[in-house]
């Protein structure tokens, strides 16, 4: 093949080599960029900056080599458009530092930085950690900091990510309240901070205030949906990023739903209960407290991490006709009570009998003196027969 006269020449099926002295000062408009998996650049003393726009359109790039060139600065977001990058060789350039953000999100198997006039400061703590942990082939390079000594010897006691403290209200929060959260950020070299509120959606109206080192967040007119939702404060410095998540508990009264019994391995009377704080529960059967046993018991499904509602079953193991009847679930928390009832028929009565005859079942009555049709409204002093904390 004839020698290639261009600044950059094809190499293999999806590679490009740019080795003609001083031919490049940026990586804009490389030929066939979108299909490149390998890019080799050498002897480009005018190539001093590598920025986000330089690698746009190089989405397939796996290997990038820029060596013996004039590279002085690599932007923190330079490799945003090259998520598949696995080998990065920037040896023998003029790099004094490289931000942790530059390699964040990449799965680099190899990172070569030897031959650069690196300058040791907390900004290279991440690289020192790579060296300590044997990542990316860094230990073999025995990196030196210009004028100082081996990167491995850099003191790092003061090289911490920011420390965050989020203050949440102590008092109970009710639906409709406004809540002020404050995130206190401490640490050296603070660069950026903010809130992540992606989980909130319609849970409240959000107003941000303040800035480093004290960020304010007002959640106005909160709804019960705010429960179990993460409100996250984050901050970054030259060492790395820290995040702290908190949840605001919004009090609301108990609610309950019952569904038609379904036959599974055991029979199940499905229910859903909600409330903050988590309500205590008790079951009634035909108006009397149902004492749970190994044959009839409450079972909860695994709760969803981001909601207060709990789903479960009243499990009945091989119920017979004596278990046919009216099932009521009572739920109560300090902010209110609720109940729901359902008729369940598991099996026809195999015996002929007079419907007026009593059925011998060992249930204790709830309140023999009460004639109230709605047990939820009763102000009886009887303790719940079954108390289950939900949440």
């Amino acid at each position: 093949a004839a020698p290639c006269p261009d600044a950059c020449c094809p190499h293999g099926s999806s590679g490009l080599r740019c080795t003609r002295d001083g031919a490049l000062d940026s990586l804009h408009h490389l030929p066939g960029a979108e299909n490149l998996t390998e890019l080799y650049i050498e002897n480009q003393q005018h190539l001093q900056h590598l920025e986000l726009r330089d690698l746009r359109g190089l989405g397939e790039l796996r290997n990038l080599t820029i060596v013996k060139s004039g590279l002085r600065f690599v932007a923190p977001d330079a490799f945003h458009f090259t998520p598949r990058l696995s080998r990065l060789n920037l040896s023998f350039n003029a790099l004094e530092s490289l931000s942790w953000k530059t390699v964040q999100g990449l799965s680099l198997q190899e990172l070569v930085l030897s031959g650069n006039p690196l300058h040791c400061s907390c900004a290279l703590r991440w690289l020192q950690r790579w060296e300590e942990e044997g990542l990316g082939g860094v230990p073999e390079q025995k990196l030196q900091c210009h004028g100082q000594g081996p990167l491995a010897h850099m003191p790092n006691a003061s090289c911490g990510v920011p420390t965050l403290k989020v203050q949440v209200p102590n008092a109970s929060v009710d639906v409709g309240d406004d809540v002020l959260l404050r995130c206190q950020v401490e640490g050296r070299g603070l660069e950026q901070a903010g809130w992540i509120l992606t989980e909130l959606e319609q849970s409240a109206t959000v107003m941000k205030s303040g800035g480093l080192p004290s960020l304010g967040l007002t959640l106005a007119n909160v709804t019960s949906d705010l429960n179990r939702k993460n409100v996250t404060c984050w901050a970054e410095n030259d060492v790395g990023r820290a995040e702290v998540s908190v949840q605001v508990n919004v009090s609301f009264p108990a609610s309950v739903q019952l569904h038609t019994a379904v036959e599974m391995h055991h029979w199940c009377i499905p229910f859903s209960v909600d409330g903050q704080p988590a309500p205590s529960l008790r079951w009634l059967f035909n108006g009397s407290v149902l004492n749970e046993t190994s044959f009839i018991f409450t079972e909860f499904l695994e709760p969803a991490a981001n909601e207060t509602v709990r789903h479960g079953c009243l499990r009945l193991n091989q119920p017979t006709h004596v278990n046919n009847g009216n099932y009521t679930l009572l739920a109560a928390n300090p902010f209110g009570q609720a109940s729901a009832s359902i008729m369940a028929a598991f099996m026809d009565n195999p015996f002929e009998f007079n419907p007026e005859d009593p059925i011998p079942v060992s249930f204790s009555p709830v309140d023999t003196n009460s004639t109230s049709g709605d047990p939820v409204e009763k102000k009886d002093e009887t303790p719940f027969g079954v108390s289950v904390a939900v949440g």
Partner: antibody, heavy 119, light 106 residues
Framework: QVQLVQSGAEVKKPGASVKVSCKAS????????MHWVRQAPGQGLEWIGT????????SFAQKFQGRVTLTRDTSTSTAYMELSSLRSEDTAVYYC????????????WGQGTTVTVSS | DIQMTQSPSSLSASVGDRVTITCRAS?????LYWFQQKPGKAPKPLIY???TLGSGVPSRFSGSGSGTDYTLTISSLQPEDFATYYC?????????FGGGTKVEIK
């Protein structure tokens, strides 16, 4: 013990050059970066540049770029700082100092060399 | 370059006094160094990376601080402590020194 011994005082005319030596003893000369710092009369300390005797890598303060040359002779464990195109404001005491990476600081200093630039 | 500003530039104190010298960096730095210099002598390292005493430095000297604000404290001034004190950063090139604080006998 670790010692840095510098050459004697110099008087130079403006436009001339001066070469100050710094002889190291008591440690492996090629392992530690050697720095040069100066102090004008009654003034503070000013960093000039550094050399790694192991491979002659150098760095300089922008202010001295092109006017200062740092060299070393590993056979005699001596570092040299040459400053050219001297001006009166280069009158100062010039120090060599070792950067001790085990504890990460300038631990040993030469006694200083007074350079006077006067017509 | 990162500027280092020392205050005060000079102070008069008596033997036994507690003396505090501050050093402020123009931007956040990783760690700080302090040197003591007596007339006609080379600087002597006093404190390295912010709070660690150099070898042979008496415990009456202490360093603290983070970010941009740092302090050198002499808990009980002794006759041999009358000197000029310099702070120095090396968070980024070039290393820079403060203007110095001269501690004189009252």
């Amino acid at each position: 013990q670790v010692q840095l011994v510098q050459s004697g005082a110099e008087v130079k005319k403006p436009g001339a050059s001066v070469k100050v030596s710094c002889k190291a003893s008591g440690y492996t000369f090629t392992t530690y970066w050697m720095h040069w710092v100066r102090q004008a009369p009654g003034q503070g300390l000013e960093w000039i540049g550094t050399i790694y005797p192991g491979n002659s890598d150098t760095s300089f303060a922008q202010k001295f770029q092109g006017r200062v040359t740092l060299t070393r002779d590993t056979s005699t464990s001596t570092a040299y700082m040459e400053l050219s195109s001297l001006r009166s404001e280069d009158t100062a005491v010039y120090y060599c100092t070792r950067f001790y990476f085990e504890d990460w600081y300038f631990d040993v200093w030469g006694q200083g060399t007074t350079v006077t630039v006067s017509s | 370059d990162i500027q280092m500003t020392q205050s005060p530039s000079s102070l008069s104190a008596s033997v036994g006094d507690r003396v505090t010298i501050t050093c402020r960096a123009s931007s956040s730095i990783s760690w700080l160094y302090w040197f003591q210099q007596k007339p006609g002598k080379a600087p002597k390292p006093l404190i390295y990376y912010t709070s660690t005493l150099g070898s042979g430095v008496p415990s009456r000297f202490s360093g603290s601080g983070s970010g941009t604000d740092y302090t050198l404290t002499i808990s009980s001034l002794q006759p041999e402590d009358f000197a000029t004190y310099y702070c120095q950063q090396w968070h980024s090139y070039p290393p820079t020194f403060g203007g110095g604080t001269k501690v004189e006998i009252k």
